[in-house]
């Protein structure tokens, strides 16, 4: 039998059963999540669940830019350092940079400082590029 790889929406890229959309629009975290949802297909700000997934995403984004942080779907809604993925994925894989936590920083970004492989926390009302994800 021929197994067809699912197709992603135009402008999105496919990796290991998921579609990813990198949006070079400046949005705060909650508006970015709403925009991801608006694309349908159950899309949310992206969860990153393994080093392999992180590396694939980082390589893709580096083809566009290497200097601006990017919102992902990890947040601390209770503001108690209890981080969770907005799409409900298990928070097992972690890739925080050394100086991530503290202050009024309850949303996570991929940091440009380490080629998007590590995360930092930031104030959720900052407007940044963002990454969406869905399973086709």
């Amino acid at each position: 039998d021929i197994i067809m790889r699912p197709s992603c929406a135009p402008g999105w890229f496919y990796h290991k059963s998921n579609c990813y959309g990198y949006f070079r629009k400046l949005r705060n975290w909650s508006d970015a999540e709403l925009e991801c949802q608006s694309y349908g297909n159950g899309a949310h700000l992206a969860s990153i669940l393994s080093l392999k997934e992180a590396s694939t995403i980082a390589e893709y984004i580096s083809g566009y830019q290497r200097s601006q942080p990017i919102w992902i779907g990890l947040h601390d809604p209770q503001k108690r350092q209890q981080w969770q993925w907005i799409d409900g994925a298990m928070y097992l894989y972690r890739s925080w940079s050394g100086k991530s936590m503290g202050g009024n920083k309850h949303c996570a970004e991929m940091s440009s400082n380490n080629n998007f492989l590590t995360w930092s926390s930031n104030e959720c009302n900052k407007r940044q590029h963002f990454l969406c994800k869905y399973r086709p």
Partner: antibody, heavy 116, light 107 residues
């Protein structure tokens, strides 16, 4: 219809602070992002910064620590304060509504001259 | 900061002519490019958003194209009310920046 109107002194002394008010009608400033943009003699436009519906700010790094944008939601006004002005700050100052990325509504602009 | 370079600086045309205005970005900005028109002693007016998306109330003779670093605003059959300054603006990264403008003047 959304309307914005800038007001404030047309003449400011060097080293003093420039303070302007933007009065908004037809739209609550608790929606969208509200921006100050200035146009220098010769027509160059410079984005100065905004105050967001969520009270967030972003400023142009070129203005260093001289700029502050605040708001009064009860009066539906937002404000620009620019400290330590020089003749280089002589410009027409516009307030505008940012509709996520672009500027759909602008005030008429107010000329501010910095001179002794 | 992203620098937007507009050309030509001045364009002298006759009403009825069709013209193209260029805006070049110093780095890739995707489709985060918008165009404005400003008449003398007035505030700028949004013409085109996201490179090519039309704006309600703006005549269809204005159209935009391009991507990443190179963008064009086309005016089909220029009318007298079109004379003035044209600016491009990027919203890809902070700080937002504007081009230095193209002046469209009557020949």
């Amino acid at each position: 219809d959304v309307q914005l109107l800038e007001s404030g002194p047309g003449l400011v002394r060097p080293s003093q602070s420039l303070s302007l008010t933007c009065s908004v009608t037809g739209n609550s400033i608790t929606s969208y992002y509200w921006t100050w943009i200035r146009q220098f003699p010769g027509n160059k436009l410079e984005w100065m910064g905004y105050i967001g519906y969520d009270d967030s700010n972003e400023y142009n790094p070129s203005l260093k620590n001289r700029i502050s944008i605040t708001r009064d939601t009860s009066k539906n006004q937002f404000f620009l304060k620019l400290n330590s002005v020089t003749s280089e700050d002589t410009a027409t100052y516009f307030c505008a509504r940012e509709d996520y990325d672009w500027f759909a509504y602008w005030g008429q602009g107010t000329l501010v001259t910095v001179s002794a | 900061d992203i620098v937007l370079t507009q050309s030509p600086v001045i364009l002298s045309v006759t009403p009825g002519d069709s013209v193209s205005l260029s805006c070049r970005a110093s780095q890739s900005i995707g489709n985060n490019l918008h165009w404005y028109h400003q008449k003398s002693h007035e505030s700028p007016r949004l013409l085109i958003k996201y490179v090519s998306q039309s704006i309600s109330g703006i005549p269809s003779r204005f159209s935009g194209s391009g991507s990443e670093t190179g963008f064009t605003l086309r005016l089909n059959s220029v009318e007298t009310e079109d004379f003035g300054m044209f600016f491009c603006q990027q919203s890809n990264s902070w700080p937002f920046t504007f081009g230095s403008g193209t002046k469209l003047e009557i020949k």
